[in-house]
Interface confidence: medium
């Protein structure tokens, strides 16, 4: 079976405050079985932004239907962006288990927030 790749093609995304940001992430294999999670930042201080198996995440919607078994697109849209949302976002595949364990991370997408146009 093909080795899993987590593809985050955008190195950075710039969005005006109040707008929505789309963060792209696709995977190249359905294996190993387990959820995708999005985090802002890395290391112990990282913040969970979206978990495929938890929720709700009121400002986050998935771009495609992630509940479909064959889905490989885990891009998300974050609404009503504020300066506090700036940072690097990582799309991370977890291996199913008790608990789920981190398997592989995308390279990250840096979100910068522009001032709202006057």
């Amino acid at each position: 079976e093909e080795e899993l790749q987590i593809i985050q093609p955008d190195k950075s995304v710039s969005v005006a405050a109040g707008e929505s940001a789309i963060l792209h992430c696709t995977i190249t294999s359905l294996f190993p079985v387990g959820p995708i999670q999005w985090f802002r930042g890395a290391g112990p201080a990282r913040v969970l932004i979206y978990n495929q198996r938890q929720g709700p995440f009121p400002r986050v919607t998935t771009v495609s239907e992630t509940t479909k078994r064959e889905n490989m697109d885990f891009s998300i849209s974050i609404s009503n962006i504020t300066p506090a949302d700036a940072g690097t976002y990582y799309c991370i595949k977890f291996r199913k288990g008790s608990p789920d364990t981190e398997f592989k991370s995308g390279a990250g997408t840096e979100l910068s927030v522009r001032a709202k146009p006057s």
């Epitope: 790749q5 593809i7 093609p9 955008d10 190195k11 950075s12 995304v13 792209h24 390279a107």
Partner: antibody, heavy 119, light 108 residues
Framework: DVQLVESGGGVVRPGESLRLSCAAS????????MNWVRQAPGEGLEWVSL????????YYADSVKGRFTISRDNSKNTLYLQMNSLRAEDTAVYYC????????????WGLGTLVTVSS | ETVLTQSPGTLTLSPGERATLTCRAS??????LAWYQEKPGQAPRLLIY???SRATGIPDRFSGSGSGTEFTLTISSLQSEDFAVYYC??????????FGGGTKVEIK
Amino acid sequence: DVQLVESGGGVVRPGESLRLSCAASGFTFSSYDMNWVRQAPGEGLEWVSLISGSGEIIYYADSVKGRFTISRDNSKNTLYLQMNSLRAEDTAVYYCAKENNRYRFFDDWGLGTLVTVSS
Amino acid sequence: ETVLTQSPGTLTLSPGERATLTCRASQSVYTYLAWYQEKPGQAPRLLIYGASSRATGIPDRFSGSGSGTEFTLTISSLQSEDFAVYYCQQYYDRPPLTFGGGTKVEIK
């Protein structure tokens, strides 16, 4: 204006080594990921290697993995490619290419330096 | 690895004619596709990125279209300086970043 000037090419025998340099000017070098791309005579473009602005992230094409080493000196605004165990199929013009700051396409290229591997 | 296939290999046209170059990807690259022009003794030059956005300073006779796996570079009216080799490059599935094999546009 962005300028990328490659140097260090030449004629070597199979198994020998060569070090290419790319002197960059006209932009904040440390803020940009840099690449080496090559073109064998009469052939198309082939991506060789990538290094992030900080030098922490490095990738190689399978064809050069284990033989070539990419590095950079941000204090000197210079990109390097150390080529060891050279083979005839490494004969090519080697281009230094600056990545766009948002995506992995190449905004600017040097004129290239020719590496010939021949016995 | 995403394979890019360019066609035709060579396009023989006269100045003033329209050139249509095609690039096909082995899997979807969405719109993460760039086009470059290469002339002998010169550095490759970025023409198009994002499948359809012209790079700075590129004349509007160059246009790009497509998404997913099928892409087209069109030169609406060939000028003498447009006779060159053109390459597509995907930057969605990376690394490795991959290029097409090139299309040579030559004078009839």
